[in-house]
């Protein structure tokens, strides 16, 4: 029950996170005009990853797309790439996790397959969240650098007689949306990974030591060598030719009909 709840909650949190990452990527307010030096301007500038906008006091908003690809700063391209990779990974992760949900029955899918899918989606969510956080942080760093550079050049003009107020940009709403969304996706991914451990059906562990009959007839677990991500509990990813004792510090699981030889 706790596993199902953890998996379900992880899915919902990741879903909200990825929706947030998509929203942040599409938002125009990645950087907004800093009004500290000109709080009474009738024209307000803000920029996104895809276009820059100008909002006038009259209520009119005019946006222009960045129609060039080569003329854009490398950092902006990198941020775009990170956000898109985050969205793609997140979307695939969501798709995988839907099928991995314990509450959804798809044919005769084994718990082991669901566990693997849960783990895969969890890792995807973690990477997706990290991509979003990295993208937003790179952009924020770029803003901070440019902000202080433009502050240093703030008042330049004809012999200092004319004030040319340079437009400085500060953090826009999209950055905060991106950070929160990336964090949520990351948390959702961790929850999925935790749920995976509880989902994996493992061998019964008795309080003391369990002995398997030794002999010529070697028992293999059904599905012996499974495709594995190589992460998580290793007990399911090996042939068990145990001829010996299993210690009790392994994860407790309910006995299945195959556990008795």
């Amino acid at each position: 029950m706790a596993v199902t709840a953890c998996q379900g909650l992880g899915f919902v949190v990741s879903l909200i996170g990825i929706a947030g990452i998509i929203a942040a990527t599409c938002m125009d307010q990645w950087s907004t005009q800093d009004l500290y030096n000109n709080p009474v301007t009738a024209v307000f500038n803000y920029q996104g990853l895809w276009r820059s906008c100008v909002r006038e006091s009259s209520g009119f908003t005019e946006c222009r797309g960045y129609f060039t690809l080569l003329g854009l700063p490398a950092m902006l391209q990198a941020v775009r790439a990170l956000m898109i990779v985050g969205i793609v990974l997140g979307a695939i992760g969501l798709l995988v996790s839907i099928f991995a949900l314990k509450c959804i029955r798809i044919g005769s899918m084994e718990d082991s397959a669901k566990a693997n899918m849960t783990l895969t989606s969890g890792i995807m969510f973690i990477v997706s969240g990290l991509c979003a956080i990295a993208g937003v942080s790179v952009f924020a760093n770029m803003l901070v650098t440019n902000f202080w550079m433009s502050t240093a050049n703030m008042y330049t003009g004809m012999g200092g007689m004319v004030q040319t107020v340079q437009t400085r940009y500060t953090f826009g709403a999209a950055l905060f949306v991106g950070w929160v969304a990336g964090g949520l996706t990351l948390i959702g991914g961790v929850m999925m990974c935790i749920a995976c451990r509880g989902l994996a059906p493992e061998e019964t562990n008795y309080k003391a030591v369990s002995y398997h009959a030794s002999g010529h007839s070697v028992a293999y677990k059904p599905g012996g060598f499974k495709a594995s991500t190589g992460f998580g509990s290793n007990t399911k990813n090996k042939k068990i030719y145990d001829g010996g004792a299993r210690t009790e510090d392994e994860v407790q699981s309910y006995p299945s009909k195959h556990d008795y030889v």
């Epitope: 005009q33 000109n38 009474v40 301007t41 009738a42 024209v43 500038n45 803000y46 920029q47 820059s52 906008c53 100008v54 006038e56 006091s57 009259s58 209520g59 009119f60 005019e62 222009r64 004319v162 004030q163 040319t164 107020v165 340079q166 437009t167």
Partner: antibody, heavy 116, light 113 residues
């Protein structure tokens, strides 16, 4: 067609307050801002303030303390209220429609004389 | 507040001549975001309210004759009347639309010989 018409008291005693109404037609106050501009006799234009479609206002710094602009969208009316009038407030008062921060249509103006 | 300085304060010219008047602002009126200069020119004929001539420093209002041309960027702007007509007798005002308060210049009075 777009029209703006100012109506005011004409004569105001010093230290009294002034109220002018600008009645508009041909456009909605929920879509356009309205500016107030005055012109003392034989002098240049002086911007007083503006009320935007959302109801937010901006004023001339020197007059901010005694100037107030409001509106009634349903009646298509904009109101200018100025307190503590002095003789140098004698002017022709105009209201004008905003279009992308420029004033494209102007009223004919109402003359206000501050005198005892 | 942005100070708008117009020159000359008055100008006496003959019909058919080319007229140029200037307007300087104490601060740049160029908005980097859309590369527009938020400066407007108005014409006020005697006994009439002002009339919009040019906005964004160089965009002519519809119905305004093409002999009126606005130019300039940042802090220096010019209004040119290519071939002066008798009906152009008026006072011309420039206005800052970029930063509150929306200050006007003191005007250039155009008189015809």
């Amino acid at each position: 067609q777009v029209q703006l018409k100012e109506s005011g008291p004409g004569l105001v005693a010093p230290s009294q307050s002034l109220s002018i109404t600008c009645t508009v037609s041909g456009f909605s106050l929920t879509s356009y801002g309205v500016h107030w501009v005055r012109q003392p006799p034989g002098k240049g234009l002086e911007w007083l303030g503006v009320i935007w479609p959302g109801g937010n206002t901006n004023y001339e710094s020197a007059l901010m303390s005694r100037l107030s602009i409001s509106k009634d969208n349903s009646k298509s009316q904009v109101f200018l209220k100025m307190n503590s009038l002095q003789t140098d407030d004698t002017a022709m008062y105009y209201c004008a429609r905003d279009r992308r921060l420029a004033m494209d249509y102007w009223g004919q103006g109402t003359s206000v004389t501050v005198s005892s | 507040d942005i100070v708008m300085t117009q020159s000359p304060s008055s100008l006496t010219v003959t019909a058919g001549e080319k007229v140029t008047m200037t307007c300087k602002s104490s601060q740049s009126l160029l908005n980097i975001g859309n590369q527009k200069n938020y400066l407007t020119w108005y014409q006020q004929k005697p006994g009439q309210p002002p009339k919009l001539l040019i906005y964004w420093a160089s965009t002519r209002e519809s119905g305004v004759p093409d002999r009126f041309t606005g130019s300039g960027s940042g802090t220096d702007f010019t209004l040119t009347i290519s071939i002066l007509q008798a009906e152009d007798l008026a006072v011309y005002y420039c206005q800052n639309d970029y930063s509150y308060p929306f200050t006007f210049g003191s005007g250039t009075k155009l008189e015809i010989k």
